[in-house]
Interface confidence: low
Amino acid sequence: HPEPHTAELQLNLTVPRKDPTLRWGAGPALGRSFTHGPELDKGQLRIHRDGIYMVHIQVTLAICSSTTASRHHPTTLAVGICSPASRSISLLRLSFHQGCTIASQRLTPLARGDTLCTNLTGTLLPSRNTDETFFGVQWVRP
Amino acid sequence: HPEPHTAELQLNLTVPRKDPTLRWGAGPALGRSFTHGPELDKGQLRIHRDGIYMVHIQVTLAICSSTTASRHHPTTLAVGICSPASRSISLLRLSFHQGCTIASQRLTPLARGDTLCTNLTGTLLPSRNTDETFFGVQWVRP
Amino acid sequence: HPEPHTAELQLNLTVPRKDPTLRWGAGPALGRSFTHGPELDKGQLRIHRDGIYMVHIQVTLAICSSTTASRHHPTTLAVGICSPASRSISLLRLSFHQGCTIASQRLTPLARGDTLCTNLTGTLLPSRNTDETFFGVQWVRP
């Protein structure tokens, strides 16, 4: 196979979030992030090769303690396919409960044109520190 | 490509920790750990091939309950490149808050000669159980 | 190499759990799960190719809050090789403490014929939502 498509993205909030969708970026200005194959469209990741991917994410809440996290519960992160609408599905979901970081990963089939959305519901702010919040995919096999 | 460089390491603390750096080991005496390509130098992992790597870690605190973790907060784990100094950067960071285990993973570019450090700050000790604390890398693409 | 063996499984509880072993399934009826190489045997995953695998898991407890998790502590998840008996070992273990989700991953050598077991000890039930509880493996190298 040609080189596997991969991407590792950093949070790219440039305005206060008015909707739950996290917007991502890649490139020298955003730590050690990159896209090799997949493409960013308005801060969301679009897949360019069919296959099974390992999707991973870590999100840390800013200015957070277990008390904060508990008081502002439920704060939930969901990763899913948001377009095309016909393929819309939640792939991975986690709640923060009394913690300030969630991290997980899973294998999932993705198709060319699938756009991945990451939604953080609740009132707390995600940290933009490049070692605390990141999102990535790695093509594994057809 | 030749076989991807990979390593899976176990904690190799032989004395009480006097500094925050965790020291790792591999081989038959340490569970199912191994190094195929990267090399251990004084308990730290040195990369031998440029590329994008999946770095993953799990650390469990020994003799820990949510009360202990909370009382000894902040206990934080950071994984980073510590040498060469010109490339020093924190790659991945998590705090324990009221939990006793952190686990995460991320894709990151690493270069031949990069040495990875894992620092556990705080007063709690990590568990050496081979299924509770481990650290590894997997080469993904150039 | 031929295509890497991979599997991504969903929880397939059909009866109330009377033993701690989680039973998994794959296929169209269970979200976006699949087996490419490994095989399911009575809800447990059997490996069909020797090599180093990335094993990952996420388990979310059903009807859970940090209070529930704390009150029902210890709730622990362990992933291991359960047969053949000569190779029985715990590979990965996490406790829930005051959280309702655990997620982790590790690299480990597995051999053809190894059967992986996932045991959830405690009184709480795992969520069967396909984006909350899943288990998978990915062959990485010989």
Partner: antibody, heavy 122, light 111 residues
């Protein structure tokens, strides 16, 4: 107990410069976003600027953009505001304020200093 | 001209209830404006009371409550006390990246 103590205010001529400082204690300074908010005599509050916890991201009100610079030194638990090209309308009590982190949308100020008065007059 | 509008002054009797409002010069206030309320007594720094429309900050007595009333944000004080006499500022999120404060309401507790 959270304490924020501002200093550096005083009388300055139009076009002049001042540097305000805010010394923080009683909390882990390096994890909080910090802000400057000002209040002209007998008037309401006006948000001036904020900086993220690690110092890499800053925002400014349009009224001060290009003239004021916010910065921080986490090793000294200190926040700064460098004010250049000062105008009469910058006359105000300047407060250092901590963002509680209660919202991902807006700064919410849960701790304030007592303020330092800046008077711009010829 | 202020974008965020508040009553310049209000009066309440001890033990009484008073509602302070916070509006937009043009348009309605919704929870998407994340209304926040601060209290300031003379010579003191402001103090956070309510955020995200209706969440009380820790240590704030439950006689203070926040809501959306019609097209405005509202701060209601029930069982007013003498030490509630202060100026109250609301803050709204209107545009990136700041908050806009209202001109303040001077509350007098007739004693």
């Amino acid at each position: 107990e959270v304490q924020l103590v501002e200093s550096g205010g005083g009388l300055v001529q139009p076009g002049g410069s001042l540097r305000l400082s805010c010394a923080a204690s009683g909390f882990t300074f390096s994890v909080y976003y910090m802000n400057w908010v000002r209040q002209a005599p007998g008037k309401g509050l006006e948000w001036v600027s904020d900086i993220n916890n690690e110092g890499g991201t800053t925002y400014y009100a349009d009224s001060v953009k290009g003239r004021f610079t916010i910065s921080r030194d986490n090793s000294k638990n200190s926040l700064y505001l460098q004010m250049n090209s000062l105008r009469a309308e910058d006359t105000a009590v300047y407060y250092c304020a901590r963002d509680a982190g209660y919202s991902n949308h807006v700064p919410i100020f849960d701790s304030w200093g007592q303020g330092t008065l800046v008077t711009v007059s010829s | 001209q202020a974008v965020v509008t508040q009553e310049p002054s209000l009066t309440v009797s001890p033990g009484g209830t008073v509602t302070l409002t916070c509006g937009l010069k043009s348009g309605s206030v919704t929870s998407d404006n994340f209304p926040t309320w601060y209290q300031q007594t003379p010579g003191q720094a402001p103090r956070l009371l309510i955020y995200n429309t209706n969440t009380r900050h820790s240590g704030v007595p439950d006689r203070f409550s926040g809501s959306i009333l019609g097209n405005k944000a509202a701060l209601t004080i029930t069982g007013a006390q003498a030490d509630d006499e202060a100026e109250y500022f609301c803050a709204l999120f209107i545009s990136n990246p700041s908050v806009e404060f209202g001109g303040g309401t001077q509350l007098t507790v007739l004693g």
